[in-house]
């Protein structure tokens, strides 16, 4: 009969730029050798190949050199995929083909996704405001994936639906820009919202603008920033905004712009003397030269490291001086953790085994829940360590260690409290004698 | 109101350095206000030195660059003028100013000669 | 650099007439420039800002006008106290440049 190939019903999501595990099983019948296995997986639509193992051994990725079996796991009838730095252009379907003496085959789906920054809000004009002008509050967000659903409402939670204009512009990575634009008459004062939701994620992300119509007073610079702050997937690229308002007349050459670490006064990159210093920030660094005159002082920092978390201050000068701080939260998702027992073969009813949850590679520190079947809270027995490498980002290892019932669940949740992200694993434990990972 | 007065020698060997500082009196606070420097030579107009910012930054004027450095002294309410490697080109009137860009307040001056 | 030319070098006025004063440069300097007003052994006196604001405590016989390259000072009647040098500063592009001063004198 056909071989029985068994891979997840629900899509995997996927971060842009982290691993991506396509789950693929089957069965190996006793004497089964790695020297039978014929393994291929392709993209289900194309048929172009993407990794194979025949011959009796690893035929390597035909893929971008980005794909990887886990040859250790192969001989017990894992033949999942480990998709590297996950792009948009690799979401869809890969289909995993097994052939031993018999064949099978399943396709399962990759759903990529990338959270959207934090709104910007801009207001135009945004000077001189006096009730009953009309204005324009355009809401950004960045580097998203998919297209992005976008709302607003006023600060009574009233939806705004009229007179709002929203377009978004995939970037050379298939990565969407969100700008929607709110045209409204100006009453009293008033608070105007944007919510930008990612609807894989489940993600959204707002801001609100304060209206209160009234001169804007003269001497400092009013420097803004966001109030809330920045937060950047390891190795992403994070814009830390900053902006101040131009008085007409302005020229470059009268701005003054130093972006600096705020606790230890490192000079991140200038602006002086009509012309970009550049990066004084491990050359990663850059202004937006095409906005500076615009009044956009907004800093892009390259390829985020653990190590660029913490504040950082834009100082402005034209003829007054105005300065805000902005604070860069670094983030990285965990791994779906990998479940192993001990002892895993031979286990009865009133054993007592130890569980092990690993998740690799996330910032910050992870929160890990335990629970078993039935949803109840595990807090005994629990011990948790997470240890950080060379780059700051945490592997954590939890143990449980429970006494076998008849039958049990147990799962673990690795939660990314920065991100809101939750990476789950559990396993079913059943009361006659079994081995783990079960064989069938 | 804001009063400044620039102090320091009158007279400076050639090649040696021009040391002048400017202190500050009347309410004027050193973290949210620029400083500058700007001279002028016997008969002649007005030449802008430098600046620097609340946070120590400072600018200097391509022709100077080389030669000048501008610092300031929060604690003392006061900031300082060198020019090193000077010749009798750089005798003039040396001026502290508030501000950047344009200039509301000024020290009343003091003249320095480059002699030897 | 902008370099800023001053004309008249030297204006004779009588006192009580209007006296015109002349700054160009060599570049536009959109609206990004200041005059200043110096007496024998006194600090330059900011007088206009922004080619036509008055600074704080200006008499409004001075008046500023002009943008781009050319731009004049106008002293609409002129007091004994107003005889002097005056200087036209840029602040439009980098670094900072004045012009080489009127001399204002009594006619």
């Known amino acids: 009969g056909a071989l029985e190939v068994q891979v997840p019903e629900d899509p995997v999501v996927a971060l842009v730029g982290t691993d991506a595990t396509l789950c693929c099983s089957f069965s190996p019948e006793p004497g089964f050798s790695l020297a039978q296995l014929n393994l291929i997986w392709q993209l289900t639509d194309t048929k172009q190949l993407v990794h194979s193992f025949a011959e009796g051994q690893d035929q390597g990725s035909a893929y971008a050199n980005r794909t990887a079996l886990f040859p250790d796991l192969l001989a017990q009838g894992n033949a999942s995929l480990r998709l590297q730095r996950v792009r948009v252009a690799d979401e869809g379907s890969f289909t995993c083909f097994v052939s031993i003496r018999d064949f099978g085959s399943a396709a399962v789906s990759l759903q990529v996704a990338a959270p959207y920054s934090k709104p910007s809000m801009t207001l135009e004009p945004n000077k001189d405001l006096r009730p009953g002008d009309t204005v324009t509050i355009t809401c950004s967000s960045y580097q998203g994936y998919p297209e992005a659903e976008v709302f607003w409402q006023d600060g009574q939670g009233v939806p705004l639906t009229g007179n709002v204009t929203t377009s978004q512009m995939a970037n050379e990575q298939g990565l969407f820009d969100v700008h929607s634009i709110l045209r409204v008459v100006l009453g009293a004062n008033g608070t105007y919202s944007c919510l930008v939701r990612n609807p894989v994620l489940q993600q959204d992300a707002h801001s609100s603008v304060t209206i209160t119509p009234q001169r804007s007073p003269t001497g400092a610079v009013e420097v803004q920033v966001p109030e809330d702050p920045v937060v950047a997937l390891v190795g992403t690229d994070a814009t830390l905004r900053c902006s101040f308002s131009p008085e007409p007349g302005f020229s470059l050459a009268q701005l003054n712009l130093i972006w600096q670490l705020t606790d230890t006064k490192q000079l991140v990159h200038s602006f002086t003397e009509g012309r970009d210093q550049g990066s004084a920030y491990a050359n990663r660094t850059a202004l937006f030269p095409d906005l500076l005159a615009q009044g956009n002082a907004s800093l892009r920092l390259q390829r985020v490291r653990v190590a660029d978390e913490g504040s950082f201050t834009c100082f402005v000068s034209i003829r007054d001086f105005g300065s805000a701080a902005v604070s860069l939260q670094v983030a990285a998702p965990y791994s779906k953790p990998s479940m192993t027992l001990e002892p895993n073969k031979d286990l009865r009813p009133g054993d007592t085994v130890t569980i092990t949850c690993s998740s690799y590679r996330g910032y910050p520190e992870a929160e890990v829940f335990w629970q078993d079947g039935q949803g109840v809270p595990l807090t005994g027995n629990v011990t948790t360590s997470q240890m950080a490498n060379e780059q700051g980002l945490f592997d954590v290892h939890s143990v449980l260690r429970v006494v076998l019932g008849a039958n049990g669940t147990y799962s673990c949740l690795v939660r990314n409290p920065v991100l809101q992200q939750d990476a789950h694993g559990s396993v079913t434990i059943t009361g006659q004698p079994m081995t783990f990972p079960p064989e069938a | 109101q804001v009063q400044l007065q620039e102090s320091g020698p009158g007279l400076v060997q050639p090649s040696g350095t021009l040391s002048l500082t400017c202190a500050v009196s009347?309410?004027?606070?050193?973290?949210?206000?620029?400083w500058t420097w700007v001279r002028q030579s016997p008969g002649q107009g007005l030449e802008w030195i430098g600046e620097?910012?609340?946070?120590?930054?400072?600018s200097y004027s391509p022709s100077l660059r080389s030669r000048v450095t501008i610092s300031v002294d929060k604690s003392k309410t006061q900031f300082s003028l060198k020019l090193s490697s000077v010749t009798a080109a750089d005798t003039a009137v040396y001026y502290c100013?508030?501000?950047?860009?344009?200039?509301?307040?000024w020290g009343q001056g003091t003249l320095v000669t480059v002699s030897s | 650099e902008i370099v800023m030319t001053q004309s008249p070098a030297t204006l004779s006025v009588s006192p009580g007439e209007r006296a015109t004063l002349s700054c160009r440069a060599s570049q536009s300097v959109s609206s990004n420039l200041a005059w200043y007003q110096q007496k024998p052994g006194q600090a330059p006196r900011l007088l206009i800002y922004g080619a036509s604001t008055r600074a704080t405590g200006i008499p409004d016989r001075f008046s500023g006008s002009g943008s781009g390259t050319e731009f004049t000072l106008t002293i609409s009647s002129l007091e004994s106290e107003d005889f002097a040098v005056y200087y036209c500063?840029?602040?439009?592009?980098?670094?900072?440049?004045f012009g080489q001063g009127t001399r204002l004198e009594i006619k």
């Open positions: 620097i910012s609340p946070i120590g930054f400072t």
């Open positions: 500063q840029q602040y439009n592009n980098w670094p900072i440049t």
């Open positions: 009347g309410g004027s606070d050193s973290s949210t206000n620029w």
């Open positions: 100013a508030r501000d950047r860009l344009y200039f509301a307040f």
